[in-house]
Interface confidence: low
C-alpha cells in the first residue's frame, strides 16, 4: 500500500486496551444527498427486472434506515410487457459498512459491521446445465 | 423514533469541543465476506445490461478500495446477442457511508462521508418525450 506520513496534528485517541478504536465525527460530509431511492430515480419501475423497495429500520445501527430491493419476478419483462421465464431477474448486491452500537444502546460507541444489501435488480441469461 | 434507555456501561467518549465524535471499533464484524464483486457473481457479464468493474482506490478513505460499475453499452443486449437501442442500460446507484481521514493522514481520526457509487446496471424502457 501507499505509506503516508502521519500528520503531527492528529488527535491522540489510541487506547491500549482497544487498539483498533478510532474517533469518528458523525457530522456527515455530503449529508444533503437523497436517502430515499424511490425519489432519486424510477428505474425500479421501468426496469425489465423491476423491484420493490423495502424499508429496513434498526435503531441500533447507523444509518438506522436502509432500503432493500426485492425483485418482483423470477423472469424479466419482455417487449410485450409480459414475464419471460427464459431470462431471470436477479438482485445486485453490495457490501456496505454500517456502524453497530456496541455495547448496545450506547450513543457514542460503535463497531464497524459489513452487511450485504440488495440495491436493485438486473436481467440475466440463466445458466443452462446441459445433460450429457 | 424509538427511544432506548442508555446502557450504564457505555464508555464516556463525549468531547465538549466535538460533540458528534464517537468511538468506533474497526475490527469489522462479518469481515470474511467477499469484497471483490467479480468473484461473488458473474451477473456483470450475463446481464442484458452488462457492466465493467473499475477499482477506485483512495488511501485517505476507509474502505480504501471501492468497485465502481460502468455500463458497457447505451442499449441493452437482445435475444440475438445484439445491442438494442430501443432500451437503455443505466447504472443502479447507491449512497454508502465511508470514513474519511480528518485531519488528512491521521490513522485514528475520521469523519463520516456519504458517497454515491454505481453498483451494477439494469435495462430500462426509455422515457419518450412526445413533442406537442
Amino acid at each position: 500500500g501507499i505509506t503516508i506520513p502521519r500528520n503531527p496534528g492528529c488527535p491522540n485517541s489510541e487506547d491500549k486496551n482497544f487498539p483498533r478504536t478510532v474517533m469518528v465525527n458523525l457530522n456527515i460530509h455530503n449529508r444533503n444527498t437523497n436517502t430515499n431511492p424511490k425519489r432519486s430515480s424510477d428505474y425500479y419501475n421501468r426496469s425489465t427486472s423491476p423491484w420493490n423497495l423495502h424499508r429496513n429500520e434498526d435503531p441500533e445501527r447507523y444509518p438506522s434506515v436502509i432500503w432493500e430491493a426485492k425483485c418482483r419476478h423470477l423472469g424479466c419483462i419482455n417487449a410485450d410487457g409480459n414475464v419471460d421465464y427464459h431470462m431471470n431477474s436477479v438482485p445486485i448486491q453490495q457490501e456496505i459498512l454500517v456502524l453497530r452500537r456496541e455495547p448496545p444502546h450506547c450513543p457514542n460507541s460503535f463497531r464497524l459491521e459489513k452487511i450485504l444489501v440488495s440495491v436493485g435488480c438486473t436481467c440475466v441469461t440463466p445458466i443452462v446445465h446441459h445433460v450429457a | 423514533g424509538i427511544t432506548i434507555p442508555r446502557n450504564p456501561g457505555c464508555p464516556n467518549s463525549e468531547d465538549k469541543n466535538f460533540p458528534r465524535t464517537v468511538m468506533v471499533n474497526l475490527n469489522i464484524h462479518n469481515r470474511n465476506t467477499n469484497t471483490n464483486p467479480k468473484r461473488s457473481s458473474d451477473y456483470y457479464n450475463r446481464s442484458t445490461s452488462p457492466w465493467n468493474l473499475h477499482r477506485n482506490e483512495d488511501p485517505e478513505r476507509y474502505p480504501s478500495v471501492i468497485w465502481e460499475a460502468k455500463c458497457r453499452h447505451l442499449g441493452c443486449i437482445n435475444a440475438d446477442g445484439n445491442v438494442d437501442y430501443h432500451m437503455n442500460s443505466v447504472p443502479i446507484q447507491q449512497e454508502i457511508l465511508v470514513l474519511r481521514r480528518e485531519p488528512p493522514h491521521c490513522p485514528n481520526s475520521f469523519r463520516l462521508e456519504k458517497i454515491l457509487v454505481s453498483v451494477g446496471c439494469t435495462c430500462v424502457t426509455p422515457i419518450v418525450h412526445h413533442v406537442a
Epitope: 423470477l74 423472469g75 419482455n78 410485450d80 409480459n82 419471460d84 421465464y85 427464459h86 440463466p126 | -
Partner: nanobody
Framework: EVQLVESGGGLVQPGGSLRLSCVAW????????VNWYRQAPGKERELVAG???????DYADSVKGRFTISRDNAKNAVYLRMNMLKPEDTAVYYC????????WGQGTQVAVST
Amino acid sequence: EVQLVESGGGLVQPGGSLRLSCVAWGFSFSIYSVNWYRQAPGKERELVAGITKGGLKDYADSVKGRFTISRDNAKNAVYLRMNMLKPEDTAVYYCNAGRENGYWGQGTQVAVST
C-alpha cells in the same frame, strides 16, 4: 398437431379448491418455461404463476400462498392447484409455453360464486 389443452375448471364456492391441468400434445413440454395466465371479463390478461424448465416457481402477489404450480415432464403436463378461492379469481385460465408468442391453450373457465 401441436397444441396445449387445459382442463379442470368449473364452478366452486368461495374458499373451495380446484386443480387445473395443462397437457402438451405434439411437442416436448420439458424444454419450456410454462405460465398460467387468466383473463376476467373486461380485464387484461394477467400472469398468475410461472414455472421454469428447471422448476423455479413464481406467483402473482394476489395468489401467493393460495396457488401452487407444478410440472410433471414425464406426463408432458403442468398443474395449477388453487386453494382458498375468492370471487375475484373468476376468469378464463390459459396455459402458455415458451415466450408470449409461443404456444397457448384455449383456456378453461373458473367461476367462484356462492
